[in-house]
């Protein structure tokens, strides 16, 4: 399987909410012994290997934000902790998973990574990630709502498998 990032850049004004999205592509094993660990984290734009560094989002680590379930089941993060930080990650039946960030500020700008790990018999088998940039803008020239820029088809499918 692969992860697609429908949008490579999200440009939002301060105070707005945004939902960053990744999509699981390709055949997904739905066996009983297969589960998917999905999560989000921030990373550095300066890294040679995109998404290799895992930093918290609003002080919540990738462990705090993870979803753990089978195949294309729906799931949400544990509400209170994430919501206290204005965050919610979710996953639907179609392989889409997302993180919603509320009341954005300039300090939320940066590179965000989604990570999917396929786990078989309690062992990590396959991991893929996707990256996207969030740019929160201030001042009179900032957009009134979030504007999204599609990934090139090459980018959106070219996700590194480890």
């Amino acid at each position: 399987f692969k992860v697609a990032t429908p949008y490579s850049l999200y440009v939002c004004p301060e105070g707005q909410n945004v939902t960053l999205t990744c999509r699981l592509l390709g055949p997904v094993d739905k066996g009983h012994d297969v589960t998917f660990y999905k999560t989000w984290y921030r990373s550095s734009r300066g890294e040679v290997q995109t998404c290799s560094e895992r930093r918290p989002i609003r002080n919540l680590t990738f462990q705090d934000l993870h979803l753990h379930h089978g195949g294309h089941q729906a799931a949400n993060t544990s509400h209170d902790l994430a919501q206290r930080h204005g965050l919610e990650s979710a996953s639907d039946h179609h392989g889409n998973f997302s993180i919603t960030m509320r009341n954005l500020t300039l300090l939320d700008s940066g590179l965000y990574c989604c990570l999917v790990v396929e786990i078989r018999h309690h062992h990590s088998e396959h991991r893929v990630h996707g990256a996207m940039e969030l740019q929160v803008q201030t001042g009179k020239d900032a957009p009134s709502n979030c504007v999204v820029y599609p990934s090139s088809s090459q980018d959106s499918e070219n996700i590194t498998a480890a």
Partner: antibody, heavy 120, light 111 residues
């Protein structure tokens, strides 16, 4: 290594404009926001504004908003700060500085500074 | 705008002795547990150089005699043993909100 190299000193008359350049090297130019900070002789540091090179977005300190314009040229990895309607109190050293906007939001690399003297 | 107030404005220290500079913000510079407060040193005739970021993290290449502490509105820069090369003006700066603002500066000289 990361370097920000600024243009040379300028002497301008009141009412004129000045355009200072800042050439970046040693990193991916479009990945980091560039800020401008000025320092009048013997005074402290004053933030002027920033430009985001990949989207061209700018935001300026209200104090300068009608007089300052920040632009960029990605082909040469250079940002520019133009200040118009100069007055004597604009005499200062002007610095460009890179913002580490990944997590820390600190100005981690600075240009050497450009002295702008406004005098009749 | 967030107003940054530094104390003292000047400091004269004997080499080998400690030094401490305080900075108070007019409102909290914290965002989800991280304080967006920096410290810079400007040596004579040079641009400022980053010493400490997010209140307590020492920038790479900065001697470990420098340390930062504090959260919310009150911050401190400490030099455990002042050396001759530490002379210059120290500035605190917040990046919690634009416009970014700096303290007035603290001039450190050697006795």
């Amino acid at each position: 290594q990361v370097q920000l190299v600024q243009s040379g000193a300028e002497v301008k008359k009141p009412g004129a404009s000045v355009k200072v350049s800042c050439k970046a090297s040693g990193y991916t130019f479009t990945s980091y926001w560039l800020h401008w900070v000025r320092q009048a002789p013997g005074q402290g540091l004053e933030w002027m504004g920033y430009i985001i090179p990949n989207t061209l977005h700018t935001d300026y300190n209200q104090k300068f908003k009608d007089r300052v314009t920040m632009t960029r040229d990605t082909s040469t990895s250079t940002v520019y700060m133009e200040l118009s309607s100069l007055r004597s109190e604009d005499t200062a050293v002007y610095y460009c500085a890179r913002l580490d906007g990944d997590y820390d939001y600190a100005l981690d690399y600075w240009g050497q500074g450009t002295l702008v003297t406004v005098s009749s | 705008d967030i107003v940054m107030t530094q104390t003292p404005l000047s400091l004269s220290v004997t080499p080998g002795q400690p030094a401490s500079i305080s900075c108070r913000a007019s409102e909290s510079v914290e965002y989800y547990g991280t304080s967006f407060m920096q410290w810079y040193l400007q040596k004579p005739g040079q641009p400022p150089q980053l010493l400490i970021y997010t209140a307590s993290n020492v920038e790479s290449g900065v001697p470990d005699r420098f340390s930062g502490s504090g959260s919310g509105t009150d911050f401190t820069l400490k030099i455990s043993r002042v050396e001759a090369e530490d002379v210059g003006v120290y500035y605190c700066q917040q990046s919690r909100k634009v416009p970014y603002t700096f303290g007035q500066g603290t001039k450190l000289e050697i006795k």
